[in-house]
């Protein structure tokens, strides 16, 4: 950057390098140039000459003042006009940024995803800081009382190696940068009961054409929890309002959901489990869609699925799946 | 449509090693992870390992430093080393994958048909 330059003088930022946004603040230049009393000393910023609040303290040294300083990064530099020669000499040059501290961080989460071996944990950073925050996420073992410490800039997988202090943890956030340090509340938490089952996947649907059509929903998970619970929600797709079925499931087998649906119409279907009776959901899974037969029977399907662990039969179909912004995770 | 289809088992001898292969094939764009489960019989079924498509890996306590997942995703195969068996890891063995089938990021869960593993 602007700061590895050879500098003949002196750049400093008053109250600070780095600075809450919004405050006013002064940068001074000051040469020490060899054989040079600057006629004029210049302030650019980014790279473009400054016009205004430059005052000219003594023979070396000017300040420039700026008044709600509003910009998060900036790279400043100073020159002077020095007699005899044709161009500006520079002086030197500094990166300045403005941000905010951190704020308290909050919603702090921590969930193992079944098979991925972490526990990742998240939170809410508040709002942004615009400058270099870092944090330090406290992992501590309520029955060693052993504390593990691991610095991140947003959110943390730890290895559930090497949470070997038992099942029950403390877990809090540090944030900190240049202008501030926040800590969270602790949060309690028991290994057994923050596993979230590996994602539930919508395969295929199919509308029968009975006296009443209906629609069944195939779904399957990779799974081995054996107590789960799922949710699943369907809309037509014209229509805001989501309607939810629950079922309690175990994932030995294909499941298979029914459904009574209008038709000709375009429905989206999404589903997200969680082990019975724990906090923490899956994220929804991707919106499938299917639209329902005027009265001929229809199959809409992502792939080829088996049936059954074991039985090698499959149904073969036609691709729906896509991916959507509404698949926030909301796993609390 | 999309096999699965695991090879490499048998009967060997506790302290014995065998290595697995699974190889997929059919309509793949993409496969994500990939999982090796066992089932014995009267029992439920049960993980053993995961590996990512960047190979990230993890391991079910009881295999862990004796099982090894590795895969190969130019061919869509994944591997199971498995060293210093013992006689509780007599199972059927099955390979399973989370298979994008087309480029609009849809996954599915596909599974092989199992290959027995036996530790005498």
């Known amino acids: 950057g602007i700061t590895n330059i050879n500098c003949s003088g002196h750049i400093w930022v008053e109250p600070a390098t780095i600075f809450k946004m919004g405050m006013n603040i002064s940068i001074y230049c000051q040469a020490a140039i060899k054989n040079c009393q600057p006629r004029k000393l210049h302030f650019y910023k980014n790279g473009i000459k400054e016009r205004f609040q430059i005052t000219r303290i003594n023979k070396t040294t000017a300040r420039l003042w700026y008044k709600n300083f509003l910009e998060p990064h900036a790279s400043m530099y100073c020159t002077a006009e020095c007699p005899k020669h044709f161009q500006e000499t520079l002086i030197c040059g500094k990166d300045i940024s403005s941000g905010y501290p951190p704020d308290i961080p909050d919603e702090v989460t921590c969930v193992i995803y079944e098979y991925s071996g972490n526990m990742t944990c998240t939170w809410n950073a508040g709002k942004l800081t615009y400058i270099d925050t870092k944090y330090v996420v406290h992992v501590k073992s309520l029955e060693t009382e052993e504390e593990q410490q691991y610095l991140t800039s947003s959110y943390i997988n730890i290895s559930t190696d090497s949470l070997q202090g038992g099942k029950k943890y403390l877990v809090w956030v540090q944030a900190a940068n240049a202008l501030g340090m926040e800590e969270s509340k602790q949060l309690q938490i028991h290994l057994d009961d923050i596993v979230i089952p590996s994602a539930a996947v919508i395969s295929r649907a199919e509308t029968i054409n009975a006296t009443v059509p209906k629609t069944i929903i195939y779904w399957d998970s990779q799974t081995t929890i054996e107590k789960v619970s799922c949710e699943m929600r369907y809309k037509a797709t014209t229509n805001q309002t989501w309607n939810v079925k629950e079922f309690d499931t175990n994932f030995t087998y294909v499941q298979q959901s029914e459904f009574y649906l209008e038709p000709n119409i375009k429905y989206v279907f999404q589903v997200r489990c969680q082990e019975t009776g724990k906090r923490y959901w899956q994220p929804w899974s991707s919106l499938f869609f299917h639209k329902t037969p005027e009265t001929v029977p229809q199959v809409t399907s992502k792939a080829f699925q088996h049936d059954t662990w074991n039985s090698g039969l499959t149904v073969a179909s036609i691709s729906t799946g896509h991916l959507t912004s509404d698949n926030r995770g909301d796993i609390g | 449509e999309v096999q699965l289809v695991e090879s490499g088992g048998g009967l060997v001898q506790a302290g014995g090693s065998l290595r697995l292969s699974c190889a997929a094939s059919?309509?793949?764009?993409?496969?994500?992870?990939m999982y090796w489960f066992r089932q014995a019989p009267g029992n439920q079924r049960e993980w053993v390992a995961r590996i990512s498509r960047e190979s990230g890996t993890s391991y079910a306590d009881s295999v862990k430093d004796r099982f090894t997942i590795s895969r190969d995703n130019a061919k869509n195969t994944v591997y199971l080393q498995m060293n210093s068996l013992k006689p509780g890891d007599t199972a059927v063995y099955y390979c399973?994958?989370?298979?994008?089938?087309?480029?609009?990021?849809?996954?599915?869960?596909?599974r092989g048909q199992g290959t027995q593993v036996t530790v005498s």
């Open positions: 399973t994958a989370d298979v994008q089938t087309n480029s609009r990021g849809a996954q599915q869960i596909f």
């Open positions: 059919g309509t793949i764009f993409r496969i994500e992870n």
